[in-house]
């Protein structure tokens, strides 16, 4: 059990388009047909103005027009809802499909893709119906852009809502070696297939992926709770033969200075097929990207019932060490290390300024007033309503 780890099934609160917790000033667009179809009129179920946001330009064939929502803080966005133009019930404009892009810092934008690499999302079939789309995988974002699409020159308009929860973990990115394929009777693909950073020279850096999506793997790593995915999907894995050093090294970057109580790593231990819990973990800490690693590393040897083949969460105490960057080495105790999730229990250090504050000056990282202090990474604190009770695989997904 990943004690205290966020549950993606419960992270489905409306984030504030419909109920106006997201102010007009945080909604913008590439263009608008007129002031009455400006970005601020893009709230789900709203009939403001002419009933939706409508771009000035055609979305065919270029697909360059977008509606942008700034959530002001990092959120896990698990679900989106779209509608067409209301116009007193006379509107005929809607978007049959769209793409999403998202950013955590306002500088680097990523395309949302589903688990099979598809970017295009099925949208609306009429102007009034709300179509909900489960985002599998969910995205960790501060800014989200909707790019409506069309298959011919036509008018498209959008109203939207986003659903999710505050990203309390504070994890901005992790860096890790590329996951590898295990060759059994069939190939088991242990790559991080939803990683949204860069991949170069055997290293993935600057992004988040399956190790931070809230989904823990099964005891048998060849199987998955996801439908229609390949063997090994839930896990990221590395062969000890690939690491002369005897360990896999990962680095974690956080939004601000935090006091780290523990790291939880969900590991596979199907030792009959070579997967073993790490023999130990060693973590180093530093406060800034160019600063020296501080003090002695925290070392934790793993005991417990290593013969039990069940997957489990391993808790690594971090002793309240203060840092914004962690580098952890996971020691091989067998042929393979397989992780499905890594999360952190931490508290924001009082008055620490956000790492990315000022990267786009008009909007502070935190809402006006002092940032919350000493919150646990486990709270949800929904911004809007109750969770939307739709699950992946529902007819609207």
């Amino acid at each position: 059990d990943m004690k205290g780890h966020f549950d993606p099934a419960k992270c489905r609160y409306a984030l504030g388009m419909q109920d106006r917790t997201i102010p007009d000033s945080d909604i913008s667009a590439s263009s608008s047909w007129s002031d009455s179809t400006a970005a601020r009129h893009s709230r789900l179920e709203s009939s403001d103005g002419d009933g939706a946001w409508c771009p000035a330009g055609s979305v065919f064939p270029k697909e360059e027009e977008y509606l942008q929502v700034d959530l002001q803080r990092l959120h896990l966005v698990a679900l989106v809802g779209t509608q067409g133009r209301h116009a007193g019930g006379l509107g005929k404009e809607f978007s049959r499909s769209y793409r999403l892009r998202y950013s955590r810092d306002g500088r680097r934008w990523m395309d949302w893709k589903d688990r099979w690499g598809q970017e295009v999302i099925s949208g609306n079939e009429d102007p009034e119906g709300v179509v909900l789309k489960d985002l599998g995988p969910p995205m960790v974002a501060r800014l989200v852009r909707f790019y409506p699409r069309a298959d011919r020159v036509m008018s498209v308009c959008l109203r939207v809502e986003l659903y999710g929860c505050l990203w309390r973990d504070g994890l901005l990115s992790y860096t890790a070696p590329v996951g590898q394929t295990m060759y059994l009777s069939e190939a088991v693909y242990l790559n991080d297939s939803t990683y949204d950073g860069h991949t170069m020279g055997g290293l993935q850096y600057g992004g988040l992926g399956q190790l931070a999506d809230g989904v823990v793997g099964l005891d048998d790593f060849r199987k998955s709770q996801e439908l229609r995915v390949w063997p090994g999907y839930d896990y990221v894995g590395w062969s000890n033969h690939s690491f002369s050093s005897g360990y896999v090294e990962m680095e974690f970057e956080f939004d601000r200075l935090r006091a780290f109580q523990a790291m939880q790593v969900h590991c596979n231990n199907m030792h009959t097929l070579g997967a073993r819990l790490p023999g130990g973990v060693e973590c180093r800490f530093r406060r800034g990207p160019a600063m020296a690693w501080e003090g002695e590393p925290m070392r934790h040897n793993l005991g417990g019932n290593l013969g039990d083949p069940r997957a489990r969460a391993v808790s690594v105490p971090l002793g309240g060490r203060v840092a914004r960057f962690l580098q952890c080495r996971f020691l091989f105790a067998g042929p393979w290390l397989l992780f499905s999730e890594i999360s952190f229990i931490s508290d924001v250090v009082n008055n620490s300024s956000p790492a990315l504050g000022g990267t786009f000056p008009p909007a502070p990282w935190w809402p006006p007033g002092p940032p919350p202090t000493n919150f646990s990474s486990l709270e949800l604190e929904p911004r809007g309503q109750q969770p939307v009770a739709k699950a992946e695989g529902s007819p609207t997904a």
Epitope: V178, G201, G202, H241, S244
Partner: antibody
């Protein structure tokens, strides 16, 4: 254009030192594991050493102590410092970049053209 | 240190022949093996990484197999441009020894 260009190879007397350079263009050296490999005339490929993106170095047992790999990120250049050179160090020296294939395993996907070092009195 | 041993050191074959080259590691290396082709006066060219994975642009007549300590490179139907020397390499994040090479010559 993504490429590696070695330089610094020449005729050198036994016992002397020599530094080879490998300049990268089209990518950042510090994002990759970089290797030096050599090939004596008419012989096979011989791994000399590797530098990781974290600047950890690994050497073949025969190269430890005499050969040193380093890099200058500002110049995007990899170096091989060779000391106490011997006749048997005569070879073409290559630098190469390690990348992962679709299955996550490394291979040397990019090589320089090589530079010839001749150790002779 | 791990040693890589290739056999045969040379093989004579004709166009259209099936050619098999083997590589043996002194201890288990899992699937951490790459194969290269080198022609005289040229730098080596990556053919396969991770035992099986063909590098971009490599023809499908090349294939790799094996795991642990014993590995094979197969050319299913030798073409004129395939006459060259082939090397295996254990290539982890760290030490990376090559095999001694196998020269494929025209019969």
């Amino acid at each position: 254009q993504v490429q590696l260009v070695e330089s610094g190879g020449r005729v050198v007397q036994p016992g002397r030192s020599l530094r080879l350079s490998c300049t990268a263009s089209g990518f950042s050296l510090n994002r990759y594991y970089m290797l030096w490999v050599r090939q004596a005339p008419g012989k096979g490929l011989e791994w000399i050493g590797t530098i990781s993106y974290g600047d950890t170095t690994y050497y073949a047992s025969w190269a430890k102590g005499r050969f040193t790999i380093s890099r200058d990120n500002s110049k995007n250049t990899l170096y091989l410092q060779m000391n106490s050179l011997r006749a048997e160090d005569t070879a073409v020296y290559y630098c190469a970049r390690a990348d992962t294939g679709d299955n996550g395993y490394l291979g040397l996907q990019l090589w320089g053209q090589g530079t010839l070092v001749t150790v002779s009195s | 240190d791990i040693q890589m041993t290739q056999s045969p050191s040379s093989v004579s074959a004709s166009v259209g022949d099936r050619v098999t080259i083997t590589c043996q590691a002194s201890q288990s290396i899992g699937s951490v093996l790459a194969w290269y082709q080198q022609k005289p006066g040229k730098a080596p060219k990556l053919l396969i990484s991770g035992v099986f994975d063909l590098a971009s642009g490599v023809p499908s007549r090349f294939s790799g197999s094996g795991s642990g300590t014993d590995f094979t490179l197969t050319i299913s139907s030798l073409q004129p441009e395939d006459f060259a020397t082939y090397y295996c390499q254990y290539i982890p994040y760290g030490s990376s020894p090559f095999g001694g090479g196998t020269k494929v010559e025209i019969k």
